[in-house]
């Protein structure tokens, strides 16, 4: 079994990002009904069964490290309260740590594969679409917050892959 | 694509301290570290430390800490590498380096050095 | 903290010729951390192997990576004259995170 407590620690530090996330809200969703859009997240790829330790944990470090890069850009320095980027920060630097030292041993266990190229990649796309979203619309008051509301939804569809972790553990 | 633009060279006295400066440009994220790393003349690698401006947090090698400061502008993004108690075998080209946002799975991103920059010589000489 | 052994220090060889450079760690590597770099003279290092056998944007496919545990391989099957230069191997571990680098190898014309 793996010396790291990787479901307890995530999960919480998930809970503290989707917290973080709510208080970021600027602008009401209602009012920016005309700017929704389909991200088309890649659910099937957090629903399967397939994934080895190491290929699940390497999925969710993407989805973080990708939010991350996304919320530490220029553009989003202004769009948010520097306060509650530095907590989402924060957060999400603490996850990304949590998993990598997970990855670091189950990697040794059976010398599993570190990844699925193919959802590793659908989940680039997805933030690729997100990126061009925000690109399209001039990174608007809107456009920010329906992609807020995106991460949000997001997040939570990547529990089920934390959830199958915790019963791997 | 990253590019990495260090500070120019420099001569020190032993004893003083020398801060080097690289500014990345490009396709740049806060949310990746930016390393030194530095190579005595005729030598090999050697990794010093690490910053992610995000954040400003830091990683020491061992070797140096207690005598070393990485520091971090956010924006423009540039990394600072302040060497201080400067010694003769502190004659080296400092590099700055970061990872690519473009590996595959992200996860391997940060435990390499895809971009570098050109370099900065510090002589440390009397 | 690993220890990095690369041998030899250098390789003198013709152009054409194929050439196995060896990178020893001092403890087990996931192959998954190790890689490859190239050094010219007076440029700076090119990121050439990552995640011991894939190769980076650019890279030639004659050049190769391969191991696992402590013992890892770079593979030039047939040396162009731009190949020869320095070749470093390096580490990542973590928490916390350290780098570590072998002391290189140098492939020279013969």
């Known amino acids: 079994s793996l010396d790291c407590d990787l479901p307890q620690t995530h999960s919480l530090g998930h809970r503290r990002t989707m917290m973080l996330l709510a208080q970021m809200r600027r602008i009401s969703l209602f009012s920016c009904l005309k700017d929704r859009h389909d991200f088309r997240f890649p659910q099937e790829e957090f629903d399967g069964n397939q994934f080895q330790k190491a290929e699940a944990i390497s999925v969710l470090h993407e989805v973080i490290q990708q939010t991350f890069n996304l919320f530490s850009t220029k553009d989003s320095s202004v769009a948010w309260d520097e306060r509650l980027l530095d907590k989402l920060y924060t957060e999400l630097y603490q996850q990304l740590n949590d998993l990598e030292a997970c990855v670091m041993q189950e990697v040794w266990v059976g010398g599993t594969p570190l990844m699925n190229e193919d959802s590793i990649l659908a989940v680039r796309k997805y933030f690729q679409r997100i990126t061009l979203y925000l690109t399209e619309k001039k990174y608007s008051p809107c456009a920010w917050e329906v992609v807020r509301a995106e991460i949000m939804r997001s997040f939570s569809s990547s529990r089920n892959l934390q959830e199958r972790l915790r019963r791997k553990e | 694509e990253v590019q990495l633009l260090e500070s120019g060279a420099e001569v020190k006295r032993p004893g003083s301290s020398v801060r080097v400066s690289c500014r990345a440009s490009?396709?740049?994220?806060?949310?990746?570290?930016i390393s030194w790393v530095r190579q005595a003349p005729g030598q090999g690698l050697e990794w010093m430390g690490r910053?992610?401006?995000?954040?400003?947090?830091?990683n020491y090698a061992q070797n140096f800490r207690g005598r070393i400061t990485i520091t971090a502008d956010k924006s423009p993004l540039t990394a600072y590498l302040e060497l201080s108690s400067l010694r003769f075998e502190d004659t080296a080209v400092y590099y700055c380096a970061s990872p690519s946002a473009d590996i595959i799975p992200s996860i391997l991103g940060t435990t390499l050095f895809a971009f570098w920059g050109q370099g900065s010589l510090v002589t440390v000489s009397s | 903290e690993i220890v990095l052994t690369q041998s030899p220090g250098t390789l003198s060889l013709s152009p054409g010729e194929g050439a196995t450079l060896s990178c020893r760690a001092s403890q087990n590597v996931s192959r998954h951390y190790l890689t490859w770099y190239q050094q010219k003279p007076g440029q700076s290092p090119r990121l050439l192997i990552y995640g011991g056998s894939s190769r980076a944007t650019g890279v030639p496919d004659r050049f190769s990576g391969g191991g696992s545990g402590t013992d890892f391989t770079l593979t030039i099957s047939r040396l162009e004259p731009e190949d020869f230069a320095v070749f470093y191997c390096?580490?990542?571990?973590?928490?916390?995170?350290?780098?570590?680098f072998g002391q290189g190898t140098k492939v020279e014309i013969k």
């Open positions: 490009g396709d740049t994220f806060s949310s990746y570290p």
């Open positions: 390096q580490s990542y571990h973590s928490p916390p995170p350290v780098y570590t």
């Open positions: 910053i992610l401006p995000a954040l400003g947090v830091t």
